[in-house]
């Protein structure tokens, strides 16, 4: 990780951004370290790797310098803290962050002893915070699920931390790809699994579409298609965001056509952009394009009680587009504009010369 | 052959609401979607929103927290709404359908707008 | 929002010259763009549509060009029925918008 021994506050928030943290006793102003065998409270002006800390799946605290996460033994509960192998099924792994309480299991929370070792109490009630970030909550930092793209696990998330070639990564990875595509595991190891798939890759928007984009080549757009996948509309909205794209609009029959064409071999309705989720504004494109051109099936309902308000496409279906309840997990596809150009430049808006 | 017919008080006093209604003829409401523009004296169109039977409506930002465009699909009629009127209000008031081609399969494509109301004068003034 | 600008204000014409009216949008509109014709006390009628198609019932003496953020109407020959304001208008965003107008007059 190449943390300095001392932490200075500009790096404190670099990290902090990235979601990891140090976790600093309310009370005691000390910082939680992870050392070899105990978690004890050390001055947090000595900041170091291990007092860095991130919220990773399954409700998991892992701790950056000791590639650990921390653990809660039942069969001696009230014994030191310590980090385990993040997926141990000997110790409980899980825990919540409710108003600057870190708990577990039945009750027990993260504590301090008097020798200023980190033990798991039910005993009394110790507030822990951000350190560095002006009193912050350590609950803002809490995991969010990143859905993968292709791969071979139709879109489930990455699981944090993963090992792979006997190091335990917290974030997705470069690694072992020629292609130098991002990636990470979507279960715990990746050489005993082989679970994996890409991540979304912000950097990737500015070099355009890579090899898990298609371009057409007529109108400088790339798509996406996650036919695979199976997210709910604002988890596919995310992941299209998260690269520098979009969820999909279309603009004209020409862009409905080349979408058809890549779904051919899949009869299957996918997400689009199309959202109803401002009530006083009804649908509109996530992109903001406009609604120039409409294909909505005609067995849609748009009474005001009906509860579905995100759009999708379907390719096996001539009038193609359909409204959903918004939590449904569906596959879907993204849509990226190239260069930045100002998408309205190279959107269709030739629909005249069909006619 | 479609028709626009807009209707209302053409005299509405100042911090009152404006209320007219455009009543369509020769069409389902539901094919298209219904603009109302506005002409003060002497001076160009501003446009101030549309709506779509789906529940799809914009509003001219100027305008946006004064104004409310809502359809009523069983009576073929569309309704403007504007509160907290003053004499800047003063204008013609059109009611319009967006104009659609087919497209060559089951779409639609939306333009300018095609049929306009002849304009109802509203006066603000107390 | 999309600021649409027309010139000029004013077009003074005599019968059968050709009348060319532009439209400039302070950002790309593709081709989303339709032309009005308006007589005093009458309401607006739609000319031109998607730029450059004519819509039903208008003579081919008008036309339409442009795409992107620059647009023009001609009027190859004027007629004296042709003497009126003509406004441009934009749906390429979400949020229409209206250019001031030209008047065509007679010289």
């Known amino acids: 990780e190449g943390v300095a021994a001392a932490l200075t506050p500009e790096r404190l928030l670099e990290w902090q951004d990235k979601g990891i943290f140090v976790i600093q006793s309310e009370s005691l102003k000390k910082c939680i370290q992870a050392g070899k065998s105990v978690l004890t409270l050390e001055n947090c002006k000595q900041a170091n790797k291990h007092m860095l800390w991130k919220w990773v799946s399954n409700h998991g605290l892992f701790n950056i310098g000791g590639s650990g996460c921390l653990g809660l033994n039942f069969s001696a509960p009230e014994q030191p803290l310590s980090l385990y192998e993040c997926d141990s099924t000997l110790v409980s792994l899980r825990w919540r962050c409710n108003r600057k309480m870190i708990t577990g299991p039945l009750q027990y929370s993260v504590q301090v002893a008097h020798d200023n070792t980190v033990v798991a109490s039910r005993k009394y009630i110790h507030k822990w915070i951000s350190y560095g970030s002006g009193g912050g909550d350590i609950c803002e930092y809490l995991h969010k699920d990143l859905h993968t793209i292709k791969g071979n696990t139709h879109g489930m998330p990455c699981m944090f931390p993963f090992q792979y070639n006997h190091q335990w990564h917290h974030e997705c990875t470069r690694e072992g790809r020629e292609d130098d595509l991002l990636w990470c595991a979507t279960t715990s190891r990746y050489e005993r699994d082989e679970k994996w798939g890409f991540c979304p890759d912000p950097t990737s928007a500015e070099v355009g579409c890579d090899t898990i984009w298609e371009k057409d080549l007529n109108s400088h757009i790339c798509y996406q298609f996650n036919l695979l996948s199976s997210l709910s509309w604002s988890e596919a909205h995310s992941s299209c965001q998260m690269q520098g794209g979009t969820l999909l609009s279309i603009t004209d029959e020409t862009e409905e056509n080349f979408i058809r064409e890549h779904m051919s071999s899949k009869t299957v309705e996918v997400w689009m952009g199309l959202n109803q989720l401002d009530e006083h504004a009804g649908w509109q494109w996530s992109d903001g394009t406009p609604l120039n051109y409409l294909n909505w099936s005609p067995e849609v309902n748009f009474e005001p009680f009906v509860e579905d308000h995100c759009g999708t496409f379907s390719s096996f279906m001539p009038s193609a587009w359909r409204s959903r309840d918004c939590e449904s997990t569906l596959p879907y596809i993204c849509k990226k504009y190239l260069n930045h150009i100002d998408h309205e430049i190279v959107e269709g808006g030739h629909h005249h010369h069909h006619h | 052959q479609v028709q626009l017919l807009e209707s209302g008080p053409g005299l509405v006093k100042p911090s009152e609401t404006l209320s007219l209604t455009c009543t369509v003829s020769?069409?389902?409401?539901?094919?298209?979607?219904w603009s109302w523009i506005r002409q003060s004296p002497g001076k160009g169109l501003e446009w101030i929103g549309y709506?779509?039977?789906?529940?799809?409506?914009s509003y001219n930002p100027s305008l946006r927290s004064r104004v409310t465009i809502s359809i009523d699909t069983s009576k073929n009629q569309f309704s403007l709404k504007l509160s907290s009127v003053t004499a800047a209000d003063t204008a013609v008031y059109y009611c319009?359908?967006?104009?659609?081609?087919?497209?060559?399969?089951?779409?639609?494509?939306?333009?300018?707008?095609?049929?306009w109301g002849q304009g109802t004068t509203v006066t603000v003034s107390s | 929002e999309i600021v649409m600008t027309q010139s000029p204000a004013t077009l003074s014409l005599s019968p059968g010259e050709r009348a060319t009216l532009s439209c400039r949008a302070s950002?790309?509109?593709?081709?989303?763009l339709a032309w009005y014709q308006q007589k005093p006390g009458q309401a607006p009628r739609l000319l031109i549509y998607?730029?450059?198609s004519r819509a039903t019932g208008i003579p081919d003496r008008f036309s339409g060009s442009g795409s992107g953020t620059d647009f023009t109407l001609t009027i190859s020959r004027l007629e004296p029925e042709d003497f009126a304001v003509y406004y441009c208008?934009?749906?390429?965003?979400?949020?229409?918008?209206f250019g001031q107008g030209t008047k065509v007059e007679i010289k």
């Open positions: 319009a359908r967006r104009g659609r081609i087919a497209a060559a399969g089951t779409g639609y494509y939306y333009y300018g707008m095609d049929v």
């Open positions: 020769g069409d389902s409401i539901s094919n298209y979607f």
């Open positions: 709506i779509h039977y789906s529940g799809t409506v």
């Open positions: 950002q790309s509109v593709s081709n989303y």
């Open positions: 998607g730029a450059s």
């Open positions: 208008q934009q749906y390429g965003s979400s949020l229409w918008t």
